[in-house]
């Protein structure tokens, strides 16, 4: 039993535990009652979203439109915010009742669909404190958490998970690959009060671990001892020259020698041509530079390893996960090729609820979406084949006409006679 029991004297302890779904963590005690839904947006009320979401006041920024795209599982349910202009920055945000995730789990979830076959563009969200001026949200606006997929060229196809810790944006040390196809995908970030995290794509875990291990929030636990240095007599040479080995007396021979078979040409005129010198050839007896044989070094101590000490700068922080204030969700993006659709935003404290919500939204329409896309692709293939056939037919017709123009006029004879005369149909 944990020390938690001391807090509850008398009967009904198990009932309390059960009813409140109390979970005990070493650093924190937190209650998980009804799921708290801090923010939820499915764009199911037509243009209603325009009153909830605020655009940055800048004319050259891209416009979001409400759309379910070129293909979908359910035309109404799959409506979301779609980027509509190429090579633009986008800045759009929605506020909610501010909350703190201290002592509880934080789940951030949304769907992204890059139906444009994206080449370079963001698909991530940022969670800001409520102090953000939404009309002036930009790339340098300080946020708490940034999460989601990002694609740019062949080199970047990743899920960003960035935490602002003590005023600094800290990037994850792992490479989490995002989906780069044209379908809708569900992205989930879970941050727990025991300083662990989980990233899910399509409700399946793709990464998990400890915040302290996978981000450089804190100085390292160990550092190289600054007072230690390699001793002067430390010998790192595994092999040395054999001191007893000596060069054979007949070793030194020139690399090149005059060709013994060469003869002075008969027409050589020393007055005109100078003194004749035979051409040089490689000396077959040349042995190269002599090197003494190698033996094991009796003084070899191995590679010197710098000893480590506890880092005096290091101190653990049990509240890395915690933020005092979340109040705005923002899309602050650049897209070369537009067409990305964002939908089914959810911020909650309940992992199970988020999973359920994902299954009821993305989960319900994903198969039908694929079906519609496959059908469109098939129709496109058929159209392409038809176009190719028509083109071929036109080309054959044109060739026939050309041949007729080129050939002499045909005599009016029967087919049989024509064939006998060697005329062939084009």
């Amino acid at each position: 039993s944990s020390s938690l029991e001391v807090l509850f004297q008398g009967p009904g302890l198990n009932d309390i535990f059960e009813a409140q779904k109390i979970e005990w963590h070493e650093e924190n005690l937190y209650f998980q009652g009804e799921p708290a839904v801090y923010f939820k947006e499915q764009f199911l009320d037509g243009d209603g979203w325009t009153s909830r979401w605020i655009e940055k006041h800048k004319s050259d920024f891209g416009k979001f439109v409400l759309s379910s795209g070129k293909f979908y599982g359910d035309e109404e349910k799959d409506k979301g915010l779609q980027t509509s202009q190429d090579a633009r920055f986008y800045a759009l945000s929605a506020s909610f009742e501010p909350f703190s995730n201290k002592g509880q789990t934080l789940v951030v979830q949304f769907t992204v669909k890059h139906e444009q076959n994206i080449d370079c563009g963001g698909g991530y969200v940022k969670l800001f404190p409520n102090s953000l001026d939404q009309t002036d949200m930009h790339g340098d606006s300080e946020y708490n958490i940034m999460f989601g997929p990002d694609i740019c060229g062949p080199g970047t196809k990743k899920v960003h998970v960035i935490f602002n810790y003590k005023g600094k944006n800290v990037l994850i040390n792992k490479d989490i690959r995002c989906k780069d196809d044209e379908f809708t995908h569900l992205y989930t970030l879970i941050v727990r009060p025991d300083n662990t995290y989980e990233v899910k794509i399509d409700n399946s875990q793709v990464e998990s671990g400890s915040l302290e291990d996978d981000w450089d929030f804190l100085p390292p636990k160990k550092i190289k001892d600054p007072d230690a240095s390699k001793p002067e007599d430390w010998d790192e040479r595994a092999k040395i020259d054999d001191p007893t080995d000596s060069k054979p007396e007949d070793w030194d021979k020139p690399e090149h020698i005059p060709d013994p078979d060469a003869k002075k040409p008969e027409d050589w005129d020393e007055e005109m041509d100078g003194e004749w010198e035979p051409p040089v050839i490689q000396n077959p007896e040349y042995k190269g530079e002599w090197k003494p044989r190698q033996i094991d070094n009796p003084d070899y101590k191995g590679t010197w390893i710098h000893p480590e000490i506890d880092n005096p700068e290091y101190s653990p922080d049990p509240s890395i996960y915690a933020y005092d204030n979340f109040g705005v969700l923002g899309l602050d993006l650049w897209q070369v090729k537009s067409g990305t659709i964002f939908d089914n935003f959810l911020i909650t404290n309940d992992e199970a609820y988020a999973e359920e919500f994902g299954n009821e939204t993305w989960g319900v329409t994903k198969a039908a979406e694929k079906q519609m896309k496959d059908k469109q692709d098939e129709e496109q293939r058929t159209r392409r084949m038809m176009r190719t056939k028509m083109r071929m037919r036109r080309m054959r017709r044109t060739r026939r006409k050309m041949r007729r123009k080129m050939s002499p006029a045909r005599p009016r004879t029967s087919c049989r006679e024509a064939c006998l005369q060697g005329w062939t149909e084009a």
């Epitope: 080199g155 450089d216 897209q335």
Partner: antibody, heavy 127, light 107 residues
Framework: QVQLVQSGAEVKKPGSSVKVSCKAS????????ISWVRQAPGQGLEWMGG????????NYAQKFQGRVTITADESTSTAYMELSSLRSEDTAVYYC????????????????????WGQGTTVTVSS | SYELTQPPSVSVAPGKTARITCGGN??????VHWYQQKPGQAPVLVVY???KRPSGIPERFSGSNSGNTATLTISGTQAMDEADYYC?????????FGGGTKLTVLG
């Protein structure tokens, strides 16, 4: 990894302009930010400005605003830095340097440092 | 505008640990990068994002960043480490370099 090759040394008269080129090879030009950094004889490094070819717009240090123009030609994977109204104090080695973007936002290169540098172009301003 | 302050010179005996500091207002909130420059050569990135080493940079180079000071540490300093070292950060979309520190390896 990308390699950067700069144009040759230049000798210029005060009041004139100089245009230095920086050609990238061995990487995707659009996935880098290109910075221009200069170093006067015996002095430290000084950032002049930079450009992210995929975004097109350049960014300049306050000190050089209005006198420097940085451009990029994606078709030839070449970045250019033009400095006008030259004076003797502009005598320096001019370097181009690239930082990987590793993301679609223009701020990504902040995190990665200038990991590849050109060989430098010496510009001498003298009457 | 943001300023970075480095000591003009630092001396170290071979095999010992060299520390080069870079001071800036609340520098811990920024990503600090360090460059090494040898005479007549272009700078080389030795540490990025405070403490990460690019491939090919020896393990003896490390970095840290807290409060108002970032530090480049070279443990087991070698004669070949003698060079100028510059710290750099980004501030309001502008790159800022420190004035540079000349590292002398004695002996």
């Amino acid at each position: 990894q990308v390699q950067l090759v700069q144009s040759g040394a230049e000798v210029k008269k005060p009041g004139s302009s100089v245009k230095v080129s920086c050609k990238a090879s061995g990487g995707t030009f659009s996935s880098y930010a290109i910075s221009w950094v200069r170093q006067a004889p015996g002095q430290g490094l000084e950032w002049m400005g930079g450009i992210i070819p995929i975004f097109g717009t350049a960014n300049y240090a306050q000190k050089f605003q209005g006198r420097v123009t940085i451009t990029a030609d994606e078709s030839t994977s070449t970045a250019y830095m033009e400095l006008s109204s030259l004076r003797s104090e502009d005598t320096a080695v001019y370097y181009c340097a690239s930082s990987p973007l590793r993301g679609s936002g223009w701020y990504w290169h902040y995190y990665y440092g200038m990991d590849v540098w050109g060989q430098g172009t010496t510009v001498t301003v003298s009457s | 505008s943001y300023e970075l302050t480095q000591p003009p010179s630092v001396s170290v005996a071979p095999g010992k640990t060299a520390r080069i500091t870079c001071g800036g207002n609340n520098i811990r909130s920024k990503s600090v990068h360090w460059y090494q420059q040898k005479p007549g050569q272009a700078p080389v990135l030795v540490v990025y994002q405070d403490s990460k080493r690019p491939s090919g940079i020896p393990e003896r180079f490390s970095g840290s960043n807290s409060g108002n000071t970032a530090t480049l540490t070279i443990s087991g300093t070698q004669a070949m480490d003698e060079a100028d070292y510059y710290c750099q950060v980004w501030d309001s979309s502008t790159a800022v370099f420190g004035g540079g520190t000349k590292l002398t390896v004695l002996g």
